[in-house]
């Protein structure tokens, strides 16, 4: 095999025997029973068990139940394809009782000239190709078919869709003499919403497009083509929502400016700016009308798009976000933090809290880190005493409820969950930071001190001393 | 089996120039991006210049650009390395490298080709 | 340029013990699950050699007593049970952006 390795991370069993199950007739009632969490606020472990149980005697009468994996299927317009001219696909897992539909966009960056592409293609070409996928993937987080680890969609159907686009999911360029690489991420996300409508999207009542990262970003500039697409081909009544996660990025100053070089150091404006020429980029038509000719990149940037979209959008978003910080140019390895990094780092968490003061439907912890849905533990983080599944499971009421426009909080039941406290992972919930070197796992109070956060500093504005402030924190509160 | 090897190597004057090649087989060359890592004596190994897999994008360290080229010719399975204006620091142990594409790690090494600048 | 740096810069741990060299980047080498930092082993005389790729995948037909972890900026080779054929000189080396580079080394001996 020419010493070619392939993805070998990824789980790569044999796909699953062909299905032959008939699929239900059109218009019949097959969506799962709702589960209405009202019942059961204050003893949700209780339920859950109950829940698993009940999901684990069900699996014999459901064959596909059987095995998490998701399958690879290559589209069939091998016109629609990735950077090197391979077809572009998507991985799915059919569950043949429910009408809920979740298209995840995977995340990877971008690159925005030739010579970043060329690079990338030779390091990371399993985000520029189809040629090494592999034939299954395993769903993880919100794409689990596991109850107790996606309390939230686990009994949707499931499609990965790969990043291999390289355009932020916004290009619609083919390969050409003139065109070393294929940038049709926009096009390719319409392509596979057509091809899931012959294979059971067409009954589907609700199509949540999720991403993370660059995915993120993705949602947010195709949700209202994917809404306007289904429209068009006679499918009005399929309700179109967009996730996004980690893809909630700030056009703000950098905390060292450098020159635009390689794609993780030039400013985010300036990356993009170059990209959508390079990708030939399209934004969402109400977005591109409030800015001049040239000025499309604005639409990549959250809190400028956000209002000018239709579709419902829950946003989830890492108010200390690592991709966020890098393209600012601020690593933080373990060594102290002058008081110039702190505050830049404090007014970033300050900044973007302001960008999600308008957006009902949000979820943004104070932690330092990177994307949430697809990883197993995404139950383990809350805001305000609520888990992103439980915040995700409001937000369906509330739109199922008809609160859309309403900003109203149903009761007992919130949706705009933005931590408020300053500093990174002040919230106890917080991914688990590890010493890289010892392996030890880090308390709030330890990571701040390691990160050279003086506590003296910290707890002043709280009103607190620090020795108050270490206790709480080494408390979890 | 996958193999690279290396050729050129000599001793040269400060100021002199050398071309250094790099004889690939057992693997689909115009698939893989290319690479010079040099090695001084006692030292530790130091990237110099990459060829991308089409050979239509090149980098240099900061160290030799300007007097190094790095060329590849994808039809004689062949990496070059044109150094001119040669300096006693560029003394090294040359050796070319295939990174996967999986990752852009060195998964095949030369046995490495020795480059004495000394007058 | 990411800058790596290894330590210790010289480390010397007795037959069967466990031997731990640690590499750190000045800012993140990880993206979209992966982190592109890569280990080789180097012998006097010979080419370096891939141990461990992408962080933590051992790379075939190098022992099971290898092994690599860490994500970020901050990574960790590990060599359970250290053998006399162990004893190299070893490189961390990122790429996750040109120009790649290499940590210093690291000399391995036995005490």
């Known amino acids: 095999s020419e010493g070619r390795k392939t993805w070998r991370r990824r789980g790569q069993q044999p796909p699953p025997p062909p299905r032959t199950e008939a699929a239900p007739a059109a218009g019949q009632p097959v969506e799962s029973f709702p589960l209405d969490f009202t019942a059961v606020e204050g003893n949700m472990d209780s339920f859950m068990a109950q829940v698993k149980s009940l999901a684990q005697s069900l699996y014999p009468c459901s064959a596909q139940q059987l095995n998490e994996d998701l399958r690879l299927h290559l589209l069939l317009n091998t016109s629609v394809t990735c950077n090197d001219g391979s077809p572009a696909g998507y991985y799915l897992k059919e569950s043949r009782g429910s009408r809920r539909w979740l298209l995840f966009l995977e995340g990877g960056w971008y690159c925005f000239n030739r010579e970043n592409c060329d690079s990338r293609y030779d390091t990371m070409r399993r985000l520029m190709s189809s040629r090494d996928w592999p034939r299954t993937r395993t769903g993880t987080g919100i794409l689990s078919s596991q109850p107790e680890e996606n309390p939230y969609w686990w009994n949707a159907n499931m499609v990965f869709i790969p990043y291999c686009s390289s355009d932020v999911w916004s290009g619609a360029s083919s390969k050409s003499e003139k065109n070393e690489y294929a940038f049709m991420g926009a096009l390719i996300i319409q392509e596979v919403v057509r091809e899931l409508l012959g294979r059971g999207l067409s009954g589907a009542k609700v199509l949540l497009l999720a991403g993370s990262s660059a995915g993120g970003t993705g949602v947010l500039l195709n949700v209202d083509r994917v809404a306007e697409q289904l429209e068009k081909l006679g499918y009005p009544a399929i309700q179109v929502r967009g996730l996004a996660d980690s893809g909630w990025f700030l056009d703000n100053k950098q905390y060292r400016h450098t020159d635009c070089v390689d794609t993780i150091t030039c400013a985010p404006t300036e990356a993009i700016r170059r990209g959508i020429r390079y990708w030939n980029g399209v934004v969402p038509e109400r977005c591109r009308r409030q800015f001049q000719e040239g000025e499309e990149w604005n639409c990549f940037f959250g809190y400028k798009v956000y209002p000018t979209l239709r579709c419902p959008v829950f946003v989830v978003q890492w108010l200390f976000d690592e991709a966020q910080l890098t393209v600012d140019n601020v690593h933080l390895t373990g060594q102290p933090v002058q008081e110039g990094l702190r505050l830049y780092i404090q007014n970033l968490g300050r900044e973007l809290r302001h960008t999600l003061k308008d957006v009902p439907a949000s979820f943004a912890p104070a932690c330092l880190s990177h994307e949430i849905i697809i990883r197993s533990h995404w139950t383990d983080v809350q805001v305000k005493g609520t888990s992103l599944p439980r915040a995700l499971h409001c937000w369906d009421r509330s739109l199922h409820d008809s609160h859309k426009a309403s900003k109203t909080p149903l009761k007992g039941c919130p949706v705009h969950l933005v931590d408020s406290c300053p500093w990174p992972h002040c919230n106890p919930s917080c991914p688990t930071v590890r010493d890289q070197f010892t392996g030890q796992e880090m308390n709030v109070a330890q990571f701040l001190m390691h990160m050279g956060f003086d506590m003296q500093t910290v707890a002043q504005p709280q009103g607190l001393e620090p020795s108050e402030l270490l206790g709480m924190l080494s408390n979890g509160s | 089996q996958v193999q690279l090897v290396e050729s050129g190597g000599g001793l040269v004057k400060p100021g002199g120039s050398l071309r250094l090649s790099c004889a690939a087989s057992?693997?689909?060359?115009?698939?893989?991006?290319m690479h010079w890592i040099r090695q001084a004596p006692g030292k530790g190994l130091e990237w110099v210049s990459y060829?991308?897999?089409?050979?239509?994008?090149?980098y240099y360290a900061d160290s030799v650009k300007g007097r190094f080229t790095i060329s590849r010719d994808n039809a004689k399975n062949s990496l070059y390395l044109q150094m001119n204006s040669l300096r006693a620091e560029d003394t090294a142990v040359y050796y070319c490298?295939?990174?996967?594409?999986?990752?852009?790690?060195?998964?095949?090494w030369g046995q490495g080709t020795t480059v004495t600048v000394s007058s | 340029d990411i800058v790596m740096t290894q330590s210790p810069d010289s480390l010397a741990v007795s037959l069967g013990e466990r031997a731990t060299i640690n590499c750190r980047a000045s800012k993140s080498v990880s993206t979209s699950g992966y982190s592109y930092i890569h280990w080789y082993q180097q012998k006097p005389g010979q080419p370096p050699k891939l141990l461990i790729y992408l962080a933590s995948d051992l790379e075939s037909g190098v022992p099971d007593r290898f092994s690599g972890s860490g994500s970020g900026t901050d990574f960790t080779l590990t060599i359970s049970s250290l053998q006399a054929e162990d004893v190299a000189v070893y490189y961390c080396?990122?790429?996750?952006?040109?120009?790649?580079?290499f940590g210093q080394g690291t000399k391995l001996e036995i005490k």
């Open positions: 057992g693997f689909t060359f115009s698939d893989f991006g």
């Open positions: 060829s991308s897999s089409g050979g239509t994008t090149v």
């Open positions: 490298a295939r990174a996967s594409y999986d990752g852009g790690y060195f998964d095949c």
């Open positions: 080396h990122h790429s996750r952006e040109l120009p790649f580079t």
